[in-house]
Interface confidence: medium
Amino acid sequence: EAHKSEIAHRYNDLGEQHFKGLVLIAFSQYLQKCSYDEHAKLVQEVTDFAKTCVADESAANCDKSLHTLFGDKLCAIPNLRENYGELADCCTKQEPERNECFLQHKDDNPSLPPFERPEAEAMCTSFKENPTTFMGHYLHEVARRHPYFYAPELLYYAEQYNEILTQCCAEADKESCLTPKLDGVKEKALVSSVRQRMKCSSMQKFGERAFKAWAVARLSQTFPNADFAEITKLATDLTKVNKECCHGDLLECADDRAELAKYMCENQATISSKLQTCCDKPLLKKAHCLSEVEHDTMPADLPAIAADFVEDQEVCKNYAEAKDVFLGTFLYEYSRRHPDYSVSLLLRLAKKYEATLEKCCAEANPPACYGTVLAEFQPLVEEPKNLVKTNCDLYEKLGEYGFQNAILVRYTQKAPQVSTPTLVEAARNLGRVGTKCCTLPEDQRLPCVEDYLSAILNRVCLLHEKTPVSEHVTKCCSGSLVERRPCFSALTVDETYVPKEFKAETFTFHSDICTLPEKEKQIKKQTALAELVKHKPKATAEQLKTVMDDFAQFLDTCCKAADKDTCFSTEGPNLVTRCKDALA
């Protein structure tokens, strides 16, 4: 229904706290360099204005669209051109072009320092002094580093953060209470960020239809007892919610997500028997819980998929009559029978089925032609299954750090032109798949591994798009989203690459490495490993292991030495010489 004042409508629906949080996220995602104080000031102005519109919807400017109101606020920021360069040109445009322009200037890899967590005592002090400002800082810092973070979900993580601080700041040993809990939230939030970025990429590159297909597959796996019309209804609504969030319409997105959660909880009977626990929770927790609810039990009496989609004499007629609905039904039926497959795999199978019907329904004897289609799915299913087995075996043998190193070597060989920081970040993220997925029960491994890898590779593609350097990466990133992971897996050593010359300074380390946290030490070592592979792309695993073991021994020795600086300056050059010899 149309409202006289959109901003008043959203303020009323969302309530002041969520309204302010979402406006802060929106501004932080658009203008990623502004300080918290600058954004907080704008948020307060927008909130005060919204309140006047709630009091009188006919007041001046209350009838303006949210894009117009927010865009005007952003464009009024002083020194916009000095701080943001050509983004300031967006302000010369009218809506909706202005908003599109802002979206195009979102930076997936902003040059901001890593978000450092303060000491426990300091954190608790500032949290107790002003919890609202403290949480505002959290929203601002995460949103500006992750400009496509799913806004209502970020409010959920802020709420988690708040609860952890409330609990731990009352404890004697704040540090040991806070660290593991906040690490857990951070890990989940980072995964949520790459997953959502993948959804926005799907929407931006391939449109709503592609996202809706993803949603149909995912929802059918989770709710196998819901009928096709129910799944399509949920997929349609979910597509709208994601389109809004990806498009920067965060108030609408959060409002519609709350509506969808309400609908699901009111219609549990036709959706799933597993929703009640989620539905008992307050809004943010409820929506989060529904998004990762366990799969419902599959109906016991499902007929074989072949009956309707291969053996039925009317397959081509049904397909011709309504292609999208018929293919949607196929995707629904196949997905509800296979919670053990990844969504990417299910979409590849649906694509294969569509291609088969396109070809066969034009032939003289269609049933003879499409009769083997299910058998032709076999290699498509085996490939990711083998990937999971091989990688989980390797992870179990090497542990997370060793597994990350194996992936780093593999990917540096595939795309040695890619910058070392990007390769290290990608390998570390790809390597976490072991810890995340390989410990799960057998039937949950494939969906976990492949859908997580796809999301990480999407980030690789986004970073590479900014400065394309590798033809291998360009090739894999320009295909469809669901083909990316198999494409990257199939890449081999890039034979066109001219090895980097050996630079001693790349492998020269100083005593400051000794005081770094373990994670930073690992990154330093992995940076050196990537550089080694760039120098010798065809080095054997054995050669690389020899060098890395030597390197680890060198660090261990010098960091334990009484005179660390002398140790590094005398032993370092020896290490470099041994490395060169080992790789000769």
Partner: nanobody
């Protein structure tokens, strides 16, 4: 016991309109997706349109898109099909059905109502 009773069929000229109704009983109508299917003389079943329990979304076969509108009134347990710009090829027995869980297999359907489009 599930019952579906269609009405509203008849003879109409090409370009004319008809509104079909389907009264439902014996099940919880407002939690069931519903659809219209038709069978032309000597032909197989063809689905026409689907409507979700809440009234949206709705789906149409390509052959009727833009001419037919499916709707429902959950308070009256009734399903409707508004047919405009009718053509000779729309001649068929129209059935309303409770939406099934697999493509092309209908759990319950009525006895049908005949629509004849002819000049």
């Amino acid at each position: 016991e599930v019952q579906l009773l269609e009405s509203g069929g008849g003879l109409v000229q090409p370009g004319g309109s008809l509104r079909l109704s389907c009264a439902a009983s014996g099940f919880t109508f407002d939690t069931s997706s519903m659809l219209w299917v038709r069978q032309a003389p000597g032909k197989g079943l063809e689905w026409v349109s689907v409507i979700h329990q809440s009234g949206t979304p709705t789906y149409y076969a390509d052959s009727v898109k833009g001419r037919f509108t499916i709707s429902r009134d959950n308070s009256k347990n009734t399903l409707y099909l508004q047919m405009n710009s009718l053509r000779a090829e729309d001649t068929a027995v129209y059935y309303c059905a409770k939406f099934p869980s697999t493509h092309g297999k209908f759990d319950y359907w009525g006895q049908g109502t005949l629509v004849t489009v002819s000049s």
